[in-house]
């Protein structure tokens, strides 16, 4: 099955933005939203944001989770608000992957 081709005038979605690329903004606008988790020296760093251009997120969003990084992508306004990327687990839940700043 072929990849879906981006439309000539692609729809832009509002996404939650949390992380190093967000500056002082808490949202961004793009063709895809994402929620990611990376392990930095054993510490869980969660980020959320958007891919402004379809191609930008195309490869990233298709990358399967690894022990050190995971990305989940979606399309829709604020669709990444309640998404928390999860590392692959060996058949059990892993509390250490919940978002660091969610109560």
């Amino acid at each position: 099955m072929e990849d879906e081709k981006p439309k000539v005038n692609p729809k832009l979605y509002m996404c939650v933005c949390e992380g190093l690329s967000c500056g002082n903004e808490d949202h961004c606008e793009g063709q895809q939203c994402f929620s990611s988790l990376s392990i930095n020296d054993g510490f869980h760093v969660y980020q959320k944001g958007c891919f402004q251009v379809y191609e930008q997120g195309k490869m990233t969003c298709k990358t399967p989770p690894s022990p050190g990084q995971a990305v989940e992508c979606c399309q829709g306004d604020w669709c990444n608000r309640n998404i928390t990327a999860q590392l692959p687990t060996k058949g059990k839940s892993f509390p250490g992957t919940q978002n660091f700043h969610l109560e």
């Epitope: 930095n40 020296d41 054993g42 510490f43 969610l102 109560e103």
Partner: antibody, heavy 118, light 106 residues
Framework: EVQLVESGGGLVQPGGSLRLSCAAS????????MYWIRQAPGKGLEWVSS????????YYADSVKGRFTISRDNSKNTVYLQMNSLRAEDTAVYYC???????????WGQGTLVTVSS | DIQMTQSPSSLSASVGDRVTITCKAS??????LNWFQQKPGKAPKLLIY???SLQTGVPSRFSGSGSGTDFTLTISSLQPEDFATYYC????????FGQGTKVEIK
């Protein structure tokens, strides 16, 4: 109640070895990353090492890389720090720590003192 | 590695004073910053995580703020038990602590 109890500290000569242990209780040990942090006498805190849930991924500060090895035994709820080629500058209180599901370094043990001196 | 610079390195204050400690990162760390309190001979105790979230059981006189490179820990009304050393800690990349700020009795 979460408890972390370090042991294994003591006096060792430069170039010597020591193995620290951290016995954990009060939580499902195998679900959590674990950490070692140290503090030289009268100085600040320094992150030393981290280990993931199954022990397959380990991380080290540059100052200890190649000399220290972190490991864990989930059946014993214990994390270890094997310290080789010890130097005077490794003299410190070594703390074991863990994160809660959403908060890094939320819990710490009481620490164990390692003194490297001839 | 990211450098964390705390200021001041020490300060003298009285009970009831408002105390502010700052931490500056050498590069953007977003909100990936914690604050710890340490008393002599004791392990550090977590006060604030993710820059501004109060750890359970910590009195509300403690608060944190900041994002990017500049962060602040504020004690709104200093209590006798607050005299201690305070450390910031970033986990954005190459985890590092600030050098500490000792809060002493004036």
């Amino acid at each position: 109640e979460v408890q972390l109890v370090e042991s294994g500290g003591g006096l060792v000569q430069p170039g010597g070895s020591l193995r620290l242990s951290c016995a954990a209780s009060g939580f499902t040990f195998s679900n959590y990353y674990m950490y070692w942090i140290r503090q030289a006498p009268g100085k600040g805190l320094e992150w030393v090492s981290s280990i993931n849930t199954d022990g397959g991924s380990t991380y080290y500060a540059d100052s200890v890389k190649g000399r220290f090895t972190i490991s864990r035994d989930n059946s014993k709820n214990t994390v270890y720090l094997q310290m080789n080629s010890l130097r005077a500058e490794d003299t410190a209180v070594y703390y074991c720590a863990k994160s809660t599901p959403n908060i890094p370094l939320a819990y710490w043990g009481q620490g164990t003192l390692v003194t490297v001196s001839s | 590695d990211i450098q964390m610079t705390q200021s001041p390195s020490s300060l003298s204050a009285s009970v009831g004073d408002r105390v502010t400690i700052t931490c500056k990162a050498s590069q953007n760390i977003y909100k990936y910053l914690n604050w710890f309190q340490q008393k002599p001979g004791k392990a550090p105790k977590l006060l604030i995580y993710y820059s501004n979230s109060l750890q359970t059981g910590v009195p509300s006189r403690f608060s944190g703020s900041g994002s990017g490179t500049d962060f602040t820990l504020t004690i709104s009304s200093l209590q006798p038990e607050d005299f201690a050393t305070y450390y910031c800690f970033q986990y954005s990349s190459g985890p590092t602590f600030g050098q500490g700020t000792k809060v002493e009795i004036k």
